[in-house]
């Protein structure tokens, strides 16, 4: 058979051959960082000629070209500089907002050597919509400018850029956009392993219901996770074995898959693993229907026995057939277990597709994905039951559009990636799920099902009792620390008689803990401004209690996520370099932010935290309170910027005994504490018969109700000082 000519050098770069100079061999070019090869690859045809995939004209000289990042096509309500057609590696673009708009995202972004911008999409938002302004990523064009419930926005990419993420997003009832943020990227761009590992790991961990790879305490290392979610996980590993994958690359695919299997079996969950290799046809090496699929050693040995030569007779890339074999496996399992049974319906399915190129036979893989979604009944309610991760390796002939089409679209998560080479893939799987660091103190998880008890819905919620009577509330922020209000402690330093009542699945009355130490903010002094006619002042109204023993985590006792920590960062599914300011911008991102606190009877009540100009008008009514503040000239003397304000319109007001309790928000089905209940102008419980009776203030009440909550974003130095060894704080 003729061999292909050897005059294929690339100036400034190197090349590798999958099968020497023989027909069927794939030649892959590579360039130093910051440059990309054009063309990326050539295929040796049976005629003995090189062919460039996708090329229409005759063979051109291969060159290394400089990588560039896409320019903004449009930037709303602000300006960006400098204005270039595209940006060189290392080049910056800066964003500023017009008056009345707040910048969310990164004010300055740098073009990275992989053709991707660092940071996050900059958005100038005024918080007016039901959903935050979804922004326009660099290189994209958006149609749709209304952000109300049910409104849709559509995206496309300019010129030859490729869209990854969702081309259409809808503003949902919970104030969050459906799908995942669209990004426009150069066709030659790829992902760095250090970006992929946390993104993939976070998404995967979220699916497992266990996300806290950040505990510092030594005893948590090596401890296994008790996953709180019921049910079973089916993991399907699909390994591309087509002609363009060299034998060495296939070995790394296998090794990466083994790493994944090893990690996944370290979780205390019921898991079955399927192994499928594919080229022109799929070969099922392990089926989830086989009992051995639950046994780690059996799964790994079937992976080790996967042979590169199994597919030498059919060397195309039939991704459709590979995914269809997953569909057939699901279909058989459904028939076996019964379509209507919980045993079938409670199985979560994760598909990891490792490929090096586009499918070139067997029809559209999207069709197989549609069949899979259909058989699993994937809809908004059951979205959590399927995750498809499409990972392209070797940027040669990987089709971004196809990968993006196959990967799941979930808010704040990424499921489609392209890595430069198999070494990068290995790195990703090595760092993706470092089980040794995972613990079961996952934060901010509450049971949202209709039949859950109040304590299961807010398992961080605790009651503080000085003697026999309850006096204040608080929130577990770790397995041994409670955050509450300083004004609850007015008896000097003797807390020996105090008790903290924590939720306990074994008792409806909870479990009582003694306090090892109380750390009360030294800045708190209710009489600090008495001389100014301010009879009560609640600045620095914050305290921490260290419990005498650790709380055993359960459905009834679990910490809430504190913003500005790595634990919260994982729960928000934000990138690794996020800061405290990013958390504030994400959580308190509107003029009126819906939030909650827990009532004396344990139920969750609704409030709206007023921000920006609305904060000012919310706080202003304090000037009408003549008893507590007889000669107040400046409201800010009483309501400093340490406070969040609520109590307008239909808001519930907290009672005195609800002081110290968490003021929290829900994001991505997780809960984040942004404040703690401090003081107010109206007590709806005063003189009531019991914990279930609350009286709404009459509309004519002067002053009208207002409630003030310590803003945790303003207490960061103090929190860091005392919790630095307990939580992992992000940079401010």
């Amino acid at each position: 058979a003729p061999s292909c000519p050897q005059n294929v050098n690339i100036s400034g770069g190197t090349f590798t051959l999958s099968h020497g100079w023989a027909p069927g061999s794939l030649l892959t070019y590579s360039c130093p960082q910051g440059l990309y090869p054009s063309p990326a690859s050539r295929l040796c045809k049976s005629s003995g000629q090189w062919q460039t995939p996708g090329a229409t004209r005759s063979l051109s000289k291969a060159v290394c070209k400089p990588v560039r990042c896409p320019a903004p096509v449009s930037f709303e309500n602000g300006i960006y500089t400098p204005r270039l057609g595209s940006y060189p590696v290392g080049g910056n673009v800066s964003f500023e907002c017009e008056d009345g708009f707040i910048l969310r995202g990164s004010p300055v972004r740098q073009c990275r050597p992989n053709g991707m911008w660092d940071g996050e999409t900059a958005v100038c938002d005024n918080g007016a919509g039901h959903c935050p302004n979804p922004g326009i990523s660099l290189g994209a064009v958006r149609t749709g400018f209304r952000f109300g419930h049910g409104d849709k926005v559509r995206y496309r990419c300019s010129s030859n850029l490729v869209l990854t993420g969702s081309s259409e997003r809808e503003c949902q009832g919970n104030g969050v956009w459906s799908g995942t943020e669209p990004i426009c990227r150069q066709p030659y761009s790829y992902d760095f392993p250090e970006d992929v590992a946390p993104a993939l790991g976070t998404s995967f961990s979220h699916m497992l219901g266990a996300t806290n790879p950040t505990q510092k305490t030594k005893e948590s290392l090596g401890r296994k996770i008790q996953i709180q979610r019921s049910g079973h996980l089916n993991l399907y590993l699909l390994l591309d074995c087509s002609q363009s994958v060299s034998e060495n690359d296939f070995l790394i695919f296998k090794e990466s898959a083994s790493l994944m299997v090893d990690r996944i079996f370290s979780f205390e969950i019921n898991v079955s693993v399927a192994i499928i290799t594919f080229a022109s046809e799929p070969k099922v090496l392990m089926s989830v229907l086989n009992d051995n699929s639950r046994d780690m050693t059996e799964v790994i040995s079937s992976l080790e026995n996967a042979n590169y030569k199994d597919h030498e007779n059919g060397t195309g890339t039939n991704t459709y057939a590979a995914l269809n074999s997953v569909y057939l496996m699901m279909n058989n399992q459904m028939r076996l277990l019964g379509m209507e049974t919980m045993a079938w319906q409670e199985i979560r399915h994760a598909i990891i597709l490792l490929t090096d190129g586009k499918s070139n036979m067997g029809g559209s893989p999207k069709t197989a994905v549609d069949h899979i979604r259909e058989i699993l009944n994937i809809n908004q309610k059951r979205n959590d039951y399927l995750d498809i991760y499409a990972i392209g390796v070797g940027k040669l002939d990987v089709d971004w559009r196809e990968l993006n089409e196959l990967g799941s679209k979930k808010d704040g998560e990424r499921h489609a990636f392209i890595l430069q080479d198999t070494k990068a893939l290995h790195q990703v799987f090595e760092h993706m799920l470092d089980v040794s660091k995972l613990t079961d103190t996952i934060c901010g998880v509450g049971n949202m099902s209709a039949n859950a008890s109040d304590q299961e819905r807010t398992p961080w919620h605790v009651t503080i009792k000085p003697k026999s009577q309850e006096t204040c509330r608080g929130a577990l922020i770790s397995d041994q620390w409670v955050l509450t209000a300083a004004h609850c402690f007015r008896d000097g330093n003797d807390h020996s008689l105090w008790r903290v009542n924590v939720g306990d699945p074994k008792s409806q009355w909870g479990k009582e803990f003694l306090i090892e130490k109380a750390v009360i903010s030294p800045g708190f002094d209710v009489f600090a401004k008495k001389n100014q006619g301010i009879l009560e002042f609640y600045g620095d109204d914050i305290a921490l209690l260290k419990l005498a023993q650790k709380v055993k985590m359960s459905t009834h006792a679990r910490p809430i996520c504190l913003p500005c920590t790595m634990e919260a960062n994982l729960a928000l599914r934000r990138p690794q370099g996020s800061t405290c300011r990013d958390h504030e911008n994400e959580l308190l991102n509107k003029q009126s932010v819906p939030a909650h606190f827990v009532a004396l009877n344990g139920s969750k009540l609704n409030i709206n935290l007023k921000m920006g100009v609305e904060w000012t008008s919310c706080a202003e009514v304090v000037s009408q309170e003549k008893t507590m503040f007889p000669n107040l000239t400046d409201v800010r003397e009483v309501v400093t910027d340490q406070f969040l304000c609520s109590g307008t319109q239909e808001d519930e007001s907290p009672c005195k005994g609800e002081s110290g309790g968490a003021v929290f928000l829900e994001r991505r089905f997780r809960f984040f504490q942004v404040g703690l209940v401090s003081w107010g102008l109206y007590n709806p419980c005063l003189g009531s018969a019991d914990k279930n009776s609350r009286k709404r203030a009459p509309r004519s009440k002067v002053p009208p109700p207002r409630d003030f909550h310590i803003n945790l974003f303003r207490m960061q130095p103090w929190l860091r000082q005392h919790l630095g060894d307990v939580l992992n704080f992000l940079p401010l």
Partner: nanobody, 122 residues
Framework: QVQLVESGGGLVQPGGSLRLSCAAS????????MGWFRQAPGKEREFVSS????????EYADSVKGRFTISRDNSKNTVYLQMNSLRAEDTAVYYC???????????????WGQGTLVTVSS
Amino acid sequence: QVQLVESGGGLVQPGGSLRLSCAASGHTFRSYYMGWFRQAPGKEREFVSSISWTGGSTEYADSVKGRFTISRDNSKNTVYLQMNSLRAEDTAVYYCAADYSGDFLLSDLDSWGQGTLVTVSS
């Protein structure tokens, strides 16, 4: 727990005034919200007034607002209720109560006085 003893009740004509006192024993008096409740014959016990542990904020039932004034003297461990412009419907046994949280939930209060009778009649 705080022990409470009320005094100052009696018979008074409509439009008249009375000052009720409530003496508390226990060194933690200054940490407690203090309040007054009343119970008319055949009726439920109802909230009248309360004062915060700091003395800085006070609350009144709508029916007594502008006529009654609550105050406290932490040095004497005593809380007072000054009642002016008394009406026949103010006739009741007046009880003093102490509450650490300040909500004065009837189901949770465990510090009550024995009560002092106020009769408003001509």
